[in-house]
Structure formats: structure tokens, C-alpha cells
């Protein structure tokens, strides 16, 4: 029987800068029941606080609700593992909420085949930012990426759309049914999951374009 091994805070994420959750990985348990506590202080403070919510984020997690989340202050946190034989501490982790944002996927992805009379046909798609993200404040710049593939293909073709919420693709295989998805990331954060797939049937008379790339 031994003191517990060193835990590790291995992930912190925020969906929108208003709340966030951190997760830790326990070290070895030393063969005894082990209690874990996460303590933190904010920059400029010496007073240590205990995790406000061990439940919401699931096992081995600490959730910071709105009243505990500040974008202006860096959090300095560590996890303490304790059993009857002793204690061990994780490394201190510095958390700036700006740098842990992982938004929900973009919404309302719509895809259409456009066949203008005077130009080559193209695939046009548009989407909306996730609802939890407030883009009006200027705190967020969301970047978007699209991926698509014929239904039976193994490989995805990806296109970076920058900050735009609509996109054109010129080069597609006629007669194929395509899956299209979009995801987003804040300029300092993490990619969202991919949106649910939208399916689009490319007409058999769709004329392949020589230029493989996209237009904005």
C-alpha cells in the first residue's frame, strides 16, 4: 500500500467563454481508496478555492459555471490526490479561458447545386455559427472548414473557408451523391466537432470544371 500516484490535468474546454470544465487523469491509486480535490486561485489572488462543481463534467472533472468563470483572469489550478498513506499533487496548470474554447458545430448547413446559364455549375453551401457564440462583441473570430466526399468514397476532400459562412466548390463528380460537413474553430481555440452530414445529389449533366479549387 502506497500514497497515490501523481494526477494530471489533461484537458480544459469551454463552449463559449462563459463556462468551462477541466478533467484530470488519476495516477496510480496505491491500492487504497483515493480522494481527489481540485484547488485553484486566480491571477493576483493568493486565496485558494476548491472546485465549485465536481458533478456536471462527469468523473474526475471540475466544472466552472458562469459565476465562477472570468475571461479576464488566468486560473492557476492543481489536483490533490489523497489516501491513507499520503498525498500527491498534479503540476500546476495555467488556464486562460480564451485559449480553451471549443465551440459547438456550425448550424443549418444547406447545400445546393447551382447551374447558372452563363457559367459553369457549382456546389454552393452556407451555414450559421453555433448559437452559443456571440460574434458581435469582437472577442471571437470563427474560422470554418468544410469537408465533402462521394457517399462511397473513403477519403474526404477538405477546404478552408476562413471567416466566411458560405462557400462554392466547382469540381465535383457528376451523378454522385455527396456528404458535406462543416466545422469551426475560434482563432485561439479548438476545432468543433463536424456538423451532421448533409447529402446532395450531383446531377448527371453537371459539367466538371478544370479548376479544382473553390471560390469565395
Amino acid at each position: 500500500q502506497l500514497p497515490p500516484g501523481k494526477p494530471e490535468i489533461f484537458k480544459c474546454r469551454s463552449p463559449n467563454k462563459e463556462t468551462f470544465t477541466c478533467w484530470w487523469r488519476p495516477g496510480t491509486d496505491g491500492g487504497l481508496p483515493t480522494n481527489y480535490s481540485l484547488t485553484y486561485h486566480r491571477e493576483g489572488e493568493t486565496l485558494m478555492h476548491e472546485c465549485p462543481d465536481y458533478i456536471t463534467g462527469g468523473p474526475n472533472s471540475c466544472h466552472f459555471g458562469k459565476q465562477y468563470t472570468s475571461m479576464w483572469r488566468t486560473y492557476v489550478m492543481m489536483v490533490n490526490a489523497t489516501n491513507q498513506m499520503g498525498s500527491s499533487f498534479s503540476d500546476e496548470l495555467y488556464v486562460d479561458v480564451t485559449y480553451i474554447v471549443q465551440p459547438d458545430p456550425p448550424l443549418e448547413l444547406t447545400v445546393e447545386v447551382k447551374q447558372p446559364e452563363d457559367r459553369k455549375p457549382y456546389l454552393w453551401m452556407k451555414w450559421s455559427p453555433p448559437t452559443l457564440i456571440d460574434l458581435k462583441t469582437g472577442w471571437f473570430t470563427l474560422l470554418y472548414e468544410i469537408r465533402l466526399k462521394p457517399e462511397k468514397a473513403a477519403e474526404w476532400e477538405t477546404h478552408f473557408a476562413g471567416q466566411q459562412t458560405e462557400f462554392k466548390i466547382l469540381s465535383l463528380h457528376p451523378g454522385q451523391k455527396y456528404l458535406v460537413q462543416v466545422r469551426c474553430k475560434p482563432d485561439h481555440g479548438y476545432w468543433s466537432a463536424w456538423s451532421p452530414a448533409t447529402f446532395i445529389q450531383i446531377p448527371s449533366d453537371f459539367i466538371m470544371n478544370d479548376h479544382h479549387h473553390h471560390h469565395h
Epitope: 484537458k11 479576464w72 503540476d91 495555467y94 488556464v95 485559449y99 480553451i100 476545432w191
Partner: antibody
């Protein structure tokens, strides 16, 4: 204990490429972004770029875009910085550096001296 | 790119005496989120740089309280209240508000 251990010194000819490695240990490699910074002899520090090991997203200093390539090997918890079309001005110590969930450098590798000389 | 200008270039200090390093940025360093990402690093002889101060005035873990940072906008200062022998090295200010992140040219501190 977090450690970043870099590959050994290199001597390269102008026009060639160099690939510096940075092996991470003591933490979950994919959890934190890895930066690269260089320091020419007797000079200050210069940020090259950053990679997110969880999905290989990169952001480069425009000065190095097209010449520097940042990659990772998740299986060995190793980050790489490759610099191509080397010139004498690229002679420098190259550092990998890790932040926490922040935008400053908490941990640094020991540095790798790259000498470009004909 | 943001240019970070440090003064003086070098500083020779008697142990126990104070020291002050100035750092000026070519643009304001206030991020759109309201934070000012101005940091100070020390590179001791033959070593990699190490973080001293983050976000203008916050001492990093384990940094002695004789180090303090201050400033706002474009003008920032690092102060050492009583210099000790172990404080020798090159001090760099750094901004990470704007990409690319940039560093000052460094201030070499030596002991008299």
C-alpha cells in the same frame, strides 16, 4: 515532470533542409500546443510558429511561412520543425516550447544548434 | 509585426541594489478580450529562457517576490527590488497579443 528533449546539433549546407525533433514526456502530448522559437548567435528570440498536436492545426509567423513546416508524431509524443532552403542567417539555436492553456511559454526544450555553413 | 524595444541594452548592478528594465511596444498590447499579453523571460547563461512574469504583473510559480512587473498600453517595466547573483542573464519582454508573437532585443544584467 514535464520534459522537452530536443535532438542534437546539426551542421547544414546552404540550400538544404534541417529537421529538429522535440520529444515530450511527463504530460499528455496532445493536450497542449507546441511552439517553436529560434535565437541567432548573440541575438534575441524569434517566434516561428505553433502546432496543435491534437489535430495538427498550425499557425506560422509569416516570415517563415513556406519554409518552416511543423509536424507531430503522436505515437512517440514528438514534435518536429523542418526548415528548408537554409541560408547562413538561419544559423541559430532552435527551441521547442510549451504553454499551458495560455499564450506564454511555461516549458522549454534545451535547444538545438543549427549551423548553416558552406 | 509588433516591435518590442527594450532599454537599457545592459545593466551592471551591485548585489542588493534595485534594477529596472523598460519595454516599449510599437502598438497597444490590449487583446480584444481585454487582457494585456506582455510577459518577461530570463535567460540565464547557457540555459533556455524561463518565464518570470505573465500578463504584465503576475509572477510565475516559484519566481521570487523581488521581481515585479507593471505598465499598460505600450509601456512596461520589470523591476528587481534587490538584485542577487543568481539574477544574472538576459531579460526579454515578449508580447503574445498579436500574431506573430514577438520579443524585445533583451537586456543583459550582470553583477558589479
Amino acid at each position: 515532470e514535464v520534459q522537452l528533449v530536443q535532438s542534437g546539433a546539426e551542421v547544414k549546407k546552404p540550400g538544404s533542409s534541417v529537421k529538429v525533433s522535440c520529444k515530450a514526456s511527463g504530460y499528455t502530448f496532445t493536450s497542449f500546443w507546441m511552439h517553436w522559437v529560434r535565437q541567432a548567435p548573440g541575438q534575441g528570440l524569434e517566434w516561428i510558429g505553433v502546432i496543435d498536436p491534437s489535430d495538427t492545426y498550425t499557425n506560422y509567423n509569416q516570415k517563415f511561412k513556406g519554409r518552416a513546416t511543423l509536424t507531430v508524431d503522436e505515437s512517440s509524443s514528438t514534435a518536429y520543425m523542418e526548415l528548408s532552403s537554409l541560408r547562413s542567417e538561419d544559423t541559430a539555436v532552435y527551441y521547442c516550447a510549451r504553454g499551458d492553456y495560455s499564450n506564454w511559454f511555461t516549458y522549454w526544450g534545451q535547444g538545438t544548434l543549427v549551423t548553416v555553413s558552406s | 509585426d509588433i516591435v518590442m524595444t527594450q532599454t537599457p541594452l545592459s545593466l551592471s548592478v551591485t548585489p542588493g541594489q534595485p534594477a529596472s528594465i523598460s519595454c516599449r511596444s510599437s502598438q497597444r498590447l490590449v487583446h480584444s478580450n481585454g487582457n494585456t499579453y506582455l510577459h518577461w523571460y530570463l535567460q540565464k547563461p547557457g540555459q533556455s529562457p524561463q518565464l518570470l512574469i505573465y500578463k504584465v504583473s503576475n509572477r510565475f510559480s516559484g519566481v521570487p517576490d523581488r521581481f515585479s512587473g507593471s505598465g499598460s498600453g505600450t509601456d512596461f517595466t520589470l523591476k528587481i527590488s534587490r538584485v542577487e547573483a543568481e539574477d544574472v542573464g538576459v531579460y526579454y519582454c515578449s508580447q503574445s497579443t498579436h500574431v506573430p508573437w514577438t520579443f524585445g532585443g533583451g537586456t543583459k544584467v550582470e553583477i558589479k
